[in-house]
């Protein structure tokens, strides 16, 4: 008949493993048990894998491993008597007196509450890799971890290449014995040994769980460090950068972390496992029965099996890895999981240009001397599709892009970002809020609602700001309705008139060119150059300025750029800002001060994009270390990454404007990148691209 | 050279159909518009209508909605003008004209008689 | 549909006269108006759009002004093969709309 195998890892486990067996036969329970030996969690996944097993209880990490690459599920679930549910949180503690948050943990002394300890290590380490806090190069957690933080205590991190940094704040037993091990010598060891280190001054933050802080502070704690300790004096850090008390640990922490769980194949029947498991514990999870599944005392270990600290288990229900890891835990292990023997030795980065392989050679010369890991290699395509495609078909890795390419590299060929370009914040010309702009009359006032009809000045056909965006939007929300993809004639009829300036027309609706006025001598008019006095930003407010239009599309600094003396062109020498108004999407206006919160849509800085199974924090983590050396555009170190003047060519590889290159953090599709407004707009254009 | 050259003259009885036909050449006949503009004996210019050759898409003007459709073969770069039914009042000079850089008639065919007589 | 009314229908001139026509919209069109010359027998030839901007081709005698609802075609210098009919034609707005034609005439 059928039968359900349990893998064991260890004697031990296999010797309770056979126990269990037994006594489930012997009070006839169905299906029956047997037991496989594995050699570790990872051994049994693959043996349940291969179908030569059928059954394990694993922690968070491990359902993630097991879920993720083997595509195992999670059937049953453990409940701790002392915890929530099926859960439990990580925190991390500070001294109230203290000024650090989660995002000036850079530099901190960190306490820990050991090695690949769950809440102590992966959780936190993860989420600030995850988050883009933390960059890590070539896989290499603790030194990143060791570059991280100004000293820790990481108990069991002695046998690791940084144990000077990790072991740095650990003391030992009382007479300076055991200093950082994974265990009670250890007197910073464990949660309530972590907190002792943030306590006792050693630590500025620990890494612990939801209900340390409380155990070992308001004289709930028998050894002598803890008693004065009031809950009081702690806080917690939370993920949005704020401190919160320590009860509030449900609204602030950095994972909830899920219970462990029994794992099993895809095509295995989760009811029949828990049916099996449920008939066991009603039987055996008591005091004075023959065999305790829930106590591993007897065997001389601790929780073999299942955790010894289980109450019940439960069904579950949605029976996916994600659904029961919670994205919280989720995030964290996608931060944290990355596999120096699995990292390809060599990141090829696509290049669309002679003078770009030629910058690209000698990033990838610069970075092979520094040491950086991985490698560069260049690979030519011919296009920027021509490379995502080329990405897709795995020939490549990485290629920076524009905001519409990274639309088509998401969308087209599922590609994901993996970092992005920052510019200067007075930078207004790389990214940028589109907006509709005014002129500030009560007596005649119209929103974006009542565009049809109006008179309509534009930067130029095909600009971001001018065209693609505006239009887009109007499109997306419905205004403008093109009949048989005819973008241009839907809005020639939406529009009573137009200035668009456009280069070499074809069949150019007319009223796009009819509030355009060329050059001073009347020629040229409606040309994509600066000839026609309205083309461009500034054109396009000028446009407005003179009263041929009613409302103009441009960037949020045109009108500052242009008013209160900024512009001392006889047009708009005497333009005040506080004249015009934006008109926002909720039907509002507003004072054009109020671009960020009154726009169209924010166009994006340019991403780094790879396939969606390339490790983005490993491509973070070298560009991060190699921005340290080559990202000034002053460094000595023979290579300049955000300047192109030496290949006669500019934005190669990335735009000259960029300052350093960012984590996406939580922007981890094409549409976080790029957001929903910008998505939206390039949506309504792509709908008509027939 | 860009060059429209229109099928011949026709005569025709009321009631029966007719199909007309403009070929371009010395372009990229997908890239522009083609018109049709009628001229009435001894009278001005009536625009009839548009093609788009790309995607067949088309544009009337509504006073000839009902009465002609324009159609085009993009394969051998020619355009048409048909009706079903001919009256009388059909009769007229019809040319064929290719839009330039903007969206009205530029170039122009030398123009096809239709005689429609009982 | 917008209304183009074309002044004079018909004109005598001389060679190398002076020759204006003139042609009013029924709305507000800008600059969007195209003027045309037809020979007998022949078909259409675009001469201005814009209003004042001449097509490939054709000679500087011919010139065009005006905005909005008023238009103007002027023929500086008449020549023998400008005795023709002419239009103009709103580029606005579709339907296109022509004038009901100008016939310059020897005198």
């Known amino acids: 008949g059928m039968e359900v195998r349990w893998c064991a890892t260890s004697d031990p486990e296999q010797h309770k493993c056979g126990n269990m067996s037994e006594a489930f036969r012997e009070a006839g329970i169905q299906p029956s048990l047997l037991c496989v030996r594995g050699t570790s969690a990872d051994h049994c996944v693959q043996l349940i894998a291969a179908q030569e097993a059928d059954a394990i209880t694993l922690d968070g990490g491990a359902i993630y491993e097991a879920g993720k690459e083997h595509g195992l599920k999670p059937v049953v679930g453990e409940v701790y008597d002392q915890e929530v549910g099926t859960s439990y949180y990580a925190v991390a503690v500070v001294r109230r007196s203290s000024h650090v948050t989660i995002d000036t943990l850079k530099g901190v002394k960190s306490c820990h509450t050991g090695i690949n300890r769950t809440v102590g290590w992966n959780v936190p380490v993860g989420y600030l890799v995850e988050s883009g806090r933390l960059s890590v190069m070539g896989c290499d957690v603790l030194k990143a971890v060791s570059d991280y933080f100004g000293g820790s205590c990481v108990p069991g991190a002695g046998e690791t290449s940084y144990s000077e940094s990790l072991c740095r704040l650990c003391r030992g037993d009382s007479s300076g014995e055991g200093v950082c091990d994974k265990s009670p010598l250890e007197r910073y060891y464990d949660y309530s040994g972590a907190f002792r280190c943030l306590a006792e001054g050693a630590g500025d933050v620990a890494f612990v769980k939801h209900s340390t802080v409380l155990e070992n502070t308001d004289g709930k704690t028998l050894p002598s460090w803890g008693q004065a300790l009031l809950s009081q004096d702690f806080e917690l850090l939370c993920r949005d950068g704020s401190r919160a008390d320590v009860t509030e640990w449900r609204q602030c922490h950095l994972a909830r972390v899920p219970a462990h769980a029994v794992v099993v194949r895809a095509d295995t029947d989760g009811g029949l496992i828990f049916r099996l498991l449920n008939e066991g514990q009603r039987l055996f999870s008591h005091e004075g029965s023959s065999f305790q599944m829930f106590s591993s005392e007897a065997y001389g270990q601790k929780d073999l099996l299942f955790k010894d600290s289980t109450s019940e288990l439960v069904p579950i229900a949605t029976q996916t890895y994600e659904a029961w890891l919670g994205h919280e835990y989720l995030h964290a292990m996608k931060g944290l999981l990355c596999d120096p023997n699995r990292l390809p030795p060599y990141l090829r980065w696509c290049v669309l240009s002679t003078p770009e392989i030629q910058k690209c050679g000698d990033m990838a010369v610069a970075f092979r001397r520094q040491r950086l890991k991985p490698e560069i290699q260049c690979v030519s395509a011919k296009s920027p599709q021509h490379c995502m495609e080329r990405i897709q078909a795995e020939q490549v890795d990485a290629v920076t892009l524009s905001g519409e390419d990274i639309y088509t590299a998401g969308k087209t060929y599922g590609l994901v970002p993996a970092a992005g370009e920052h510019y200067a914040p007075e930078d207004s010309s790389n990214s940028y809020y589109v907006v509709a702009v005014v002129r500030r009359d009560s007596s005649h006032a119209f929103t974006l609602d009542e565009l049809r009809g109006k008179r309509s000045c534009h930067a130029g056909f095909g600009s971001p700001a001018g065209w693609d965006v505006p239009v887009g939007a109007l499109i997306q929300r419905g205004f403008i309705r093109p009949k048989d993809c005819d973008v241009l004639t839907a809005v020639s009829e939406f529009f009573n008139a137009s200035c668009v300036p456009v280069n070499n027309p074809k069949n150019y609706p007319s009223s796009l060119c009819a509030l355009c006025v060329g050059d001073e001598q009347g020629r040229n008019k409606c040309v994509g150059n600066s000839q026609e006095r309205y083309y461009g930003y500034r054109g396009a407010f000028r446009c407005l300025v003179e009263n041929a239009g009613d409302v103009a599309f441009v960037r949020h600094t045109t009108v500052f750029d242009n008013t209160n003396g900024h512009n001392s062109e006889p047009w708009a020498a005497e333009l005040r800002s506080e004249d015009y108004e934006l008109l926002c999407p909720n039907g509002a206006r507003a004072e054009v001060s109020q671009f960020a919160a009154c726009n169209l849509a924010q166009i994006p800085p340019h991403a780094v994009m790879v396939r969606p199974d390339t490790n983005i924090f490993t491509v973070y983590g070298l560009l991060d270390k190699a921005q340290d050396l080559f990202g000034d555009d002053h460094n000595k170190n023979g290579f300049k990454m955000f300047d192109s003047s030496n290949y006669h060519g500019q934005d190669l590889l990335f735009k000259d404007a960029t300052v350093r290159a960012v984590p996406v953090g939580e922007k981890t599709t094409y549409r976080g990148w790029l957001g929903l407004d910008y998505v939206a707009a390039l949506e309504g254009m792509s709908s008509q691209q027939c | 050279e860009v060059q429209l050259v229109q099928s011949g003259a026709e005569v025709k009885k009321p009631g029966e159909s007719l199909k007309i036909s403009c070929k371009g050449s010395?372009?990229?006949?997908?890239?522009?518009?083609l018109h049709w503009v009628r001229q009435m004996p001894g009278k001005g210019l009536e625009w009839m209508g548009r093609?788009?050759?790309?995607?067949?898409?088309?544009s009337y003007n509504q006073i000839f909605k009902d009465q002609v459709t324009i159609s085009a073969d993009k394969s051998i770069s020619t355009a048409y003008l048909q009706w079903s039914s001919l009256k009388a009042s059909d009769t007229a000079m019809y040319y064929c004209?290719?839009?330039?850089?903007?969206?009205?008639?530029?170039?122009w065919g030398q123009g096809t008689t239709v005689t429609v007589s009982s | 549909d917008i209304q183009m009314t074309q002044s004079p229908s018909s004109l005598s001139a001389s060679v190398g006269d002076r020759v204006t026509i003139t042609c009013k919209a029924s709305?507000?069109?800008?600059?969007?108006v195209a003027w045309y010359q037809q020979k007998p027998g022949k078909a259409p030839k675009l001469l201005i759009y814009?209003?004042?901007t001449r097509h490939a081709g054709v000679p500087s005698r011919f010139s065009g002004s005006g905005s909005g609802t008023d238009f103007t075609l002027t023929i500086s210098s008449l020549q023998p093969e400008d005795f023709a009919t002419y239009y103009c034609?709103?580029?606005?707005?579709?339907?296109?709309?022509f004038g009901q034609g100008t016939k310059v005439e020897i005198k």
């Open positions: 814009w209003a004042s």
């Open positions: 004209a290719r839009g330039g850089d903007y969206d009205f008639p530029w170039y």
């Open positions: 034609q709103q580029h606005y707005r579709t339907p296109w709309t």
């Open positions: 709305q507000d069109v800008y600059a969007a």
């Open positions: 010395g372009y990229s006949f997908t890239d522009y518009y």
């Open positions: 093609i788009n050759p790309y995607n067949a898409a088309t």
